[in-house]
């Protein structure tokens, strides 16, 4: 068990032209709140599919009224974290949807008026117990900055929160066959011992000493099959004489929860309470394996021997982390000589050399650039008897006096709009796409790219999605 925590840092206009109008006005003050939806695995499901790992709503933010004529600033945020508790293993791979909602505080009668301002989605790999991961996502003209982490609730530890730890009974070492719980070296891994005689096939336990039965089995040790002989038909009518109660059609009919999970109806769907070690909408997932494709960036997945993880990623050069999700900062080794600027391009390292130096690592000393001036921070380099200017990002031409257009190559996919920016370029994606270059569909497999209409809109109201 554990908690996924999300901290919203800012929500406001993104960089580039086309700043959005403030969502609030003097006539219609409003406040923001956020919703996070988590799903296990890396599936890019429709936004409306159930949040199998959990969902949470933030508190409402402070009331905000736009100052007339002022551009939309970063909007005031709710206090505190969004916390999504998870009961079982942390899957390691997950998809998220973060929605920014506006609550209008006009004088309408009855319930509040809600509308969806922005929705961002992503797929990430994250080990429980790790540091906060920072992220920036854009939705239309809006930009959301946030951090997230997953942490285990004691006594669970490990990257999936699957190991249990208890304080040591003896000061020197753990019991036979039990390991210390790094990083809690003063605690020991705790075995989960079910009630003696509990059927290993038909019973399980979530607490030491208990024996809970899978569907179809009963008795103190789950060794007795449930008899259905008193029912005339498994789908027959309810009978007061036989004591059989067969419900009509409903989401829990036939128990959609696998692996001994128990089903309860929610207002629009159903919820499975899963036994220890299982998670997912139907308790169908027992841990991330290589079949889930957990290794990023071309990492090679092999089955892991460590009980904490069902796989190990062997990372290609330039990447590290349990899922090869972190790019190694190869520039930290300072490979560029003579004060050259190191650029890690992923596939290769590049050195941008200071004036008077050249070569792949700026190892060649040149003195032919002494009388040459490169504008806008460009540096002069010589190679093959000629000298030229190596221009700073955003500039080009012989002397770096021409402003380069980073959008000329049409880098934004799927109809995204490109904006030049001091740090390069920014893509404003068309509805249904996301990513730095709009390369990822939000809703694949033909599902609608538009979110469902937000609640609280009356027929005929404009419905605008960013």
């Amino acid at each position: 068990a554990g908690v996924f925590e999300l901290q919203i840092h800012s929500f406001g206009p993104g960089p580039g032209p086309g700043a959005p109008r403030s969502p609030c006005s003097a006539r219609l003050p409003c406040r923001l709140f956020f919703r996070v939806c988590l799903k296990p695995g890396l599936s890019e499901e429709a936004a409306e599919s159930p949040c199998a790992l959990g969902a949470a709503l933030s508190a409402r933010g402070p009331v905000y009224t736009e100052q007339p004529g002022a551009p939309a600033p970063d909007l005031p945020l709710p206090d505190g974290l969004l916390q999504v508790p998870f009961r079982d293993a942390w899957p390691g791979t997950f998809s998220f949807i973060i929605e920014t909602w506006r609550e209008e505080l006009g004088d309408q009668i009855g319930g509040p008026a809600w509308s969806l301002l922005a929705r961002v989605a992503g797929r990430r790999r994250l080990a429980a117990g790790g540091p906060w991961a920072r992220d920036i996502q854009r939705a239309g003209a809006w930009e959301l900055r946030f951090s997230y982490r997953a942490r285990c609730e004691p006594p669970a530890v490990g990257t999936a929160c699957t190991r249990l730890c208890r304080p040591r009974s003896a000061p020197s070492r753990c019991g036979p066959g039990l390991r210390p719980c790094a990083p809690l070296e003063d605690e020991c891994e705790a075995p989960l011992v079910c009630r003696a005689g509990c059927s290993p096939e038909h019973g399980f336990c979530e607490q030491p000493g208990e024996c809970r039965c899978l569907e179809g089995w009963t008795g103190p040790l789950c060794t007795v099959p449930v008899s259905t002989s008193s029912c005339l038909s498994p789908r027959g009518p309810s009978s007061a004489t036989t004591g059989c109660l067969v419900p009509g059609p409903g989401p829990c009919d036939g128990n959609p929860c696998a692996n001994g999970g128990s089903c309860s109806e929610t207002p629009r769907s159903f919820e499975c309470t899963c036994p220890r070690g299982f998670y997912g909408l139907r308790c169908e997932v027992s841990g991330v394996t290589c079949a889930d494709g957990p290794c990023f960036n071309g990492g090679l997945c092999v089955g892991g021997a460590d009980p904490d993880s069902a796989y190990i990623c062997h990372c290609p050069p330039g990447f590290q982390g349990s899922n090869c999700e972190k790019r190694v900062d190869r520039c930290s080794l300072q490979p560029c000589r003579n004060g050259g600027l190191c650029l890690d391009l992923g596939h290769a390292l590049r050195c941008r050399c200071r004036a008077g130096f050249a070569g792949p690592r700026c190892e060649h000393d040149l003195d032919d650039c002494a009388g040459r001036a490169c504008a806008n921070g460009g540096t002069c380099v010589e190679g093959g008897g000629a000298h030229r200017c190596s221009c700073a990002l955003g500039f080009g031409g012989r002397d770096c006096r021409e402003r380069a257009d980073p959008c000329a190559a049409r880098p934004c996919a799927h109809g995204g709009r490109c904006y030049a920016h001091f740090s390069g370029l920014v893509c404003a994606c068309a509805p249904g796409y996301m990513g730095a270059r709009c390369e990822f569909p939000v809703h694949p497999d033909g599902a609608s790219a538009l979110p469902a209409a937000p609640p609280g809109l009356r027929p005929g109201d404009p419905q605008r999605y960013l």
Epitope: R35, P50, C51, L57, G111, P267, G456, R458, P459
Partner: antibody, heavy 124, light 106 residues
């Protein structure tokens, strides 16, 4: 302006079937996120949720009354109908319909507008 | 079923008093909803999603809590606040209400 109004018989006999209609305005059951529910309140007692129906025809019934209840909607008429079979004097209550709003499959946001209720008496 | 237990069942207070009504759920619920009902009238939504004030509800009403224990607070009672208050959960079917708390004038 959002309004809901319940209509139906005020007196039914035991074993008969009760049919109640909720007619609403100001919102549409074709709008994503909208639902209508039925709640009852016996005289001097607490509220009891009976059933609800969503814009996409997802329905929920109280398990203790499931075999007796049917909820349907007519989106074009802005109406939701609840039928309750095999009425008994213990079913005497004021029956309310209310609008329900949901963000998603997991969270009901609010049951924010209610009709004024209709008192149904079950007696022979 | 998730049982909702309100306390107290009835309460006498004076105008200007601070009043707290609690609602305890028999198992974990994500959010709590509070309604006010006056004699012969339909219930009126006060608080949704545990702590959010419905439109038109005075700011003297507030809601808080998490897990199984939730609270409705009226910071300074007004004459129009004397009514019966109900809590409700939307976590799992049946979607149950509390038995009600009747707030009377002392």
């Amino acid at each position: 302006q959002i309004t809901l109004k319940e209509s139906g018989p005020t007196l039914v006999k035991p074993t008969q079937t009760l049919t109640l209609t909720c007619t609403f305005s100001g919102f549409s059951l074709s709008t994503s996120g909208m639902g209508v529910g039925w709640i009852r309140q016996p005289p001097g007692k607490a509220l009891e949720w009976l059933a609800h129906i969503w814009w996409d025809d997802v329905k929920r019934y109280s398990p203790s009354l499931k075999s007796r209840l049917t909820i349907t909607k007519d989106t074009s008429k802005n109406q939701v109908v609840l039928t309750m079979t095999n009425m008994d004097p213990v079913d005497t209550a004021t029956y309310y319909c209310a609008r329900i709003v949901s963000f998603d499959n997991d969270v009901v946001s609010a049951m924010d507008y209610w009709g004024q209720g209709t008192l149904v008496t079950v007696s022979s | 079923d998730i049982q909702m237990t309100q306390s107290p069942s009835s309460l006498s207070a004076s105008v200007g008093d601070r009043v707290t009504i609690t609602c305890s759920a028999s198992s974990h619920v994500s959010y709590m909803y509070w309604y006010q009902q006056k004699p012969g009238k339909a219930p009126k939504l006060l608080i949704y999603l545990t702590s959010n004030l419905a439109s038109g509800v005075p700011s003297r009403f507030s809601g808080s809590g998490s897990g199984t224990d939730f609270t409705l607070t009226i910071s300074s009672l007004q004459p129009e606040d004397f009514a019966t208050y109900y809590c409700q959960q939307w976590r799992s079917n049946p979607f149950t209400f509390g038995q009600g708390t009747k707030l009377e004038i002392k």
